[in-house]
């Protein structure tokens, strides 16, 4: 077709609009071009979601979303002659898809996954209120690296929860975290029904603990040195360094964003090892200190799960009690 | 050995607050949902509230509901019941409960007494 | 909501003799049934759960059964330490609900 038409000529409604699921939660709506369309219409289609939101104008008879099933979604489709938000498309055509079958109080709840140490995930889950203490469930998962849904083997139990780790490692492609991992927990018996969840690669990392390499005094500093968990870089993480010293019985926690090792007390050119001074500390008193990191939004989405803490390590010495 | 205590029952006047704790120790606390169930004197046991183990799933009984406020602090394994509004009728023993398995209550506490009077 | 009714409300039985206690639910609650027995001025302690299987701890005397909608509490050879409130519940589906309690006498 060539240039739009008049505003005021409202194009026919697409047709065959029809909806499937991919993987596990990817929804993909096709349809046809109207007929009957006018011939100096260079078609694009609007498009939103049921609650009017991501609105899209594109010249694609498509649509995809990323979404876990856990209720309906209905995408609404209409076709116009522009990219123009404010031309009138036609009639709009809704498809919809609804979630499994089953008792909404039989499905899992609190269904959530955490990336440990970008090498493997690990995602537990509470039963279902209306479900039989023998339930048997499986988890699946896909993301973009498999070519096909795969099933989690590891189930195991702690407490009240149910959980499953699978290995996922960090592909060195630039864009493997801008992905997500697609999850479904359903049962063996096919009794209850499936819940689904979507976790983002860049939320919800847990790294390993750090390892403390060193400890020195110099004059009333003390001077910490550690190894970052394998997989990350030191400007990704931010860091806690408790300090306990016996004598005083002080706990000093301090919160660290940047850990350079520029001064020359500490040992230059180690790879993936951060450093930090504390300031005041007594060295003819035995002082413990102990290190946790975090993602930070630098890199990732989320900064709220700190790893478990390093192993102690401490310097000084303790004073005999007279 | 498992165990929860709870603490902080009393006398309070009708339409008067009070927060209930409950103390547990014994077990990983952030993998147990708690639950406080009531009984009014002379009276069977009523449910009141669950807070699931990391808190994300809260429920109350209709008849708390709007009133009655569950939490949970992980970092000290307590469980709390602020208790809002409150009437006559919730004049009763408050009980902790740890859940198990597929929701019995495996472990309860001595229970405190909420007298609510003016 | 589960109902669930208990019966009888009260018993007064001798020692050594064998009691039934059965609890009836509104619908169908599979094995989602559990027995509570509480002493007087004591906290509630758990029995039998999911029906039928026995509590770590408790004696063997007592046994339950049942699914669906109808549970029994089996006390055999009463002893007089199970002088006691004896509460059902539910926790198929939310609220909880207990059945409103049989109480067994010892003569």
């Known amino acids: 077709g060539g240039g739009g038409a008049a505003p005021t000529e409202t194009q026919p409604p697409v047709t065959n609009l029809s909806v499937s699921v991919e993987n596990l939660c990817t929804v993909i709506w096709t349809w046809n071009p109207p007929e009957g369309a006018s011939s100096n219409c260079s078609l694009w289609y609007f498009s939103h979601f049921g609650d009017k939101q991501d609105k899209k104008i594109a010249p694609e008879t498509r649509r995809s979303i990323e979404v876990p099933l856990n209720e309906r979604i209905c995408l609404q489709v209409g076709s116009q002659c522009s990219t123009n938000e404010s031309e009138k498309p036609s009639i709009l055509v809704e498809k919809c898809i609804s979630p499994p079958e089953g008792d909404p109080e039989s499905a899992v709840t609190e269904l959530q996954c955490i990336w440990h140490n970008l090498s493997y995930m690990k995602c537990s889950w509470l039963p279902g209120r209306n479900t039989s203490p023998d339930t048997n469930y499986t988890l699946y998962y896909w993301h973009r690296s498999l070519e096909k849904i795969h099933q989690c083997e590891n189930i195991f139990r702690e407490g009240q929860y149910f959980g499953c780790s699978f290995d996922l490692t960090k592909v060195k492609d630039s864009s493997f975290e801008q992905h997500s991992v697609q999850i479904m927990v359903k049962d063996n018996a096919g009794k209850i029904k499936p819940s689904f969840n979507i976790v983002p690669l860049t939320s919800r990392v847990k790294p390993d603990p750090p390892h403390i390499k060193n400890l020195s005094f110099h004059n009333d500093d003390l001077y910490v040195q550690w190894e970052n968990p394998q997989n990350f870089i030191s400007r990704c993480l931010f860091y806690e360094v408790e300090v306990n010293n016996s004598q005083t019985e002080t706990h000093n926690v301090f919160y660290v964003q940047e850990a350079k090792c520029e001064n020359p007390e500490f040992e230059r050119n180690v790879e993936n090892t951060s450093c930090f001074m504390v300031p005041g500390v007594l060295p003819d008193t035995l002082n413990t200190v102990r290190i946790r990191v975090k993602t930070n939004k630098l890199c990732y989405e989320d900064d709220k799960l700190w790893s478990n803490w390093s192993q102690e390590m401490s310097i000084g010495k303790k004073r005999n009690s007279t | 050995e498992v165990q929860v205590l709870e603490s902080g029952g009393g006398l309070v006047q009708p339409g008067g607050s009070l927060r209930l704790s409950c103390a547990a120790s014994?077990?990983?606390?952030?993998?147990?949902?708690m639950t406080w169930v009531r009984q009014a004197p002379g009276k069977g046991l009523e449910w009141v509230s669950t807070?699931?183990?990391?808190?994300?799933?809260?429920y109350y009984a209709d008849s708390v509901k709007g009133r009655f406020t569950i939490s949970r602090d992980n970092s000290k394994n307590t469980v709390y019941l602020q208790m809002n509004s409150l009437r006559a009728e919730d004049t009763a023993v408050y009980y902790c409960?740890?859940?198990?398995?597929?929701?019995?209550?495996?472990?309860w506490g001595r229970g405190t007494l909420v007298t609510v009077s003016s | 909501e589960i109902v669930l009714t208990q019966s009888p409300d009260f018993q007064s039985v001798t020692p050594k003799e064998k009691v039934t206690i059965t609890c009836r639910a509104s619908?169908?609650?599979?094995?989602?049934l559990h027995w509570y027995q509480q002493k007087p001025d004591q906290s509630p302690k758990l029995l039998i759960k999911?029906?039928?299987q026995s509590f770590s701890g408790v004696p063997s005397r007592f046994s339950g059964s049942g699914s669906g909608t109808d549970f029994t509490l089996t006390i055999n050879s009463l002893e007089a330490e199970d002088a006691a409130a004896y509460y059902c519940?539910?926790?198929?589906?939310?609220?909880?609900?207990f059945g409103q309690g049989t109480k067994l006498e010892i003569k």
């Open positions: 619908q169908s609650i599979g094995s989602s």
């Open positions: 519940m539910s926790s198929w589906g939310l609220p909880y609900t």
């Open positions: 999911y029906a039928s």
């Open positions: 409960a740890k859940e198990e398995g597929h929701w019995y209550f495996d472990v």
């Open positions: 807070i699931s183990g990391r808190g994300y799933s809260i």
């Open positions: 014994g077990f990983t606390f952030s993998n147990y949902a």
